[in-house]
């Protein structure tokens, strides 16, 4: 079969998921596509415990996650329900701020330097985290 019992090389296993942490930056859509080509998705945070795990690995650096409101309501890229799910926004966020001068508001969510979330312009080149569920990961992925 195509199911895996361990994570690919250079991915980190945690609670039946595999995570890969970039050390360079891309716009949100490009980061999203990068993960998809790895049969993964931008990280979806479903608990405080997962939040702390990701936060530990990324450090105090702006980092994209798989949450956006580009089509209206906030949505997780894997379909996890946003309204009833875990949230960790900074105070006063998300604010869809238009004052940045880059056109439009802020439609993509990222971890800030303290781990709490902020919405920002999706074109900003932030680091990103890919996640794939262990039982879904395909065989012998390439070295990343």
């Amino acid at each position: 079969g195509s199911e895996r019992t361990c994570c690919p090389v250079n991915w980190v296993e945690h609670e039946r998921s595999c995570y890969w942490f970039s050390r360079s930056g891309k716009a949100w859509a490009d980061a999203d596509n990068y993960c998809r080509l790895e049969d993964a998705h931008l990280v979806v945070v479903t608990s405080w415990e997962e939040q702390k795990f990701v936060q530990h690995h990324i450090g105090p650096v702006n980092t994209w996650m798989g949450l956006h409101d580009q089509n209206g309501p906030w949505k997780w890229v894997d379909g996890t329900d946003y309204e009833t799910g875990f949230k960790n926004w900074r105070p006063e966020q998300p604010d869809d701020w238009y004052g940045h001068g880059l056109g439009g508001g802020e439609d993509c969510a990222h971890f800030t330097d303290d781990g709490r979330w902020n919405d920002d312009v999706c074109q900003r080149p932030y680091r990103w985290v890919c996640e794939t569920e262990l039982d879904k990961a395909s065989q012998e992925p390439p070295l990343l």
Partner: antibody, heavy 121, light 108 residues
């Protein structure tokens, strides 16, 4: 030996169809996202399409979107490109290429020898 | 889309020469830049990825530099087998990886 071998090219009339194949050997095909890249005669390189490792995600250049379909059969270590509604400007050598991903950077590290597609009446 | 330009479009050089090719991106692509070599009638070959990382098996006379919008490929001492066309490629916009128009290196 790591190898990609394209086949299926040839002469086709405008509006016609063609299916290209790319057979992989010497590496774990299912571990890599795969691309098609083309090169018109005497011209530069143009990325055409990519497919994820499992085949669940596909992307296309605007110039071929809606006309070309990329697919793969990991059990056969083979990549495909179904080309419909072909136009004269699709005339090119078509290469398959594997996606190297290192620390967030991506490149095409293994290339086939190419197969020539000529669209002409 | 991100546009890539290269200069010069062609150059003539002799064996032993130091050759430098420039690539420019229409926007900041950080270090997401690859270089390929293509000989007549053959498939391209990856030389350098991530702006400066040498691909396995590529001679050390090839080197890449740059970040942001401006990049260079240098061949420190041109060898007979290096006469070819060289392409840069951005990999910032996953997966819309656009190539430069190429630089042809031929005999002086």
């Amino acid at each position: 030996e790591v190898q990609l071998l394209e086949s299926g090219g040839g002469l086709v009339q405008p509006g016609g169809s063609l299916r290209l194949s790319c057979a992989a050997s010497g590496f774990t095909f299912s571990s890599y996202a795969m691309n098609w890249v083309r090169q018109a005669p005497g011209m530069g390189l143009e990325w055409v399409s990519v497919i994820s490792r499992s085949g669940g995600y596909t992307y296309y250049a605007d110039s071929v979107k809606g006309r070309f379909t990329i697919s793969r059969d990991n059990s056969k270590n083979t990549l495909y490109l179904q080309m419909n509604s072909l136009r004269a400007e699709d005339t090119a050598v078509y290469y398959c290429a594997s996606r190297l991903a290192v620390a967030g950077s991506e490149a095409f590290d293994i290339w086939g020898q190419g197969t020539l597609v000529t669209v002409s009446s | 889309d991100i546009q890539m330009t290269q200069s010069p479009s062609s150059l003539s050089a002799s064996v032993g020469d130091r050759v430098t090719i420039t690539c420019r991106a229409s926007q900041n692509i950080s270090s997401y830049l690859n270089w390929y070599q293509q000989k007549q009638g053959k498939a391209p070959k990856l030389l350098i990825y991530a702006a400066s990382s040498l691909q396995n098996g590529v001679p050390s006379r090839f080197s890449g530099r740059g970040s942001g919008t401006d990049f260079t490929l240098t061949i420190s001492s041109l060898q007979p087998e290096d006469f070819a066309t060289y392409y840069c490629q951005q990999s910032y916009r996953t997966p819309l990886f656009t190539f430069g128009p190429g630089t042809k290196v031929d005999f002086k």
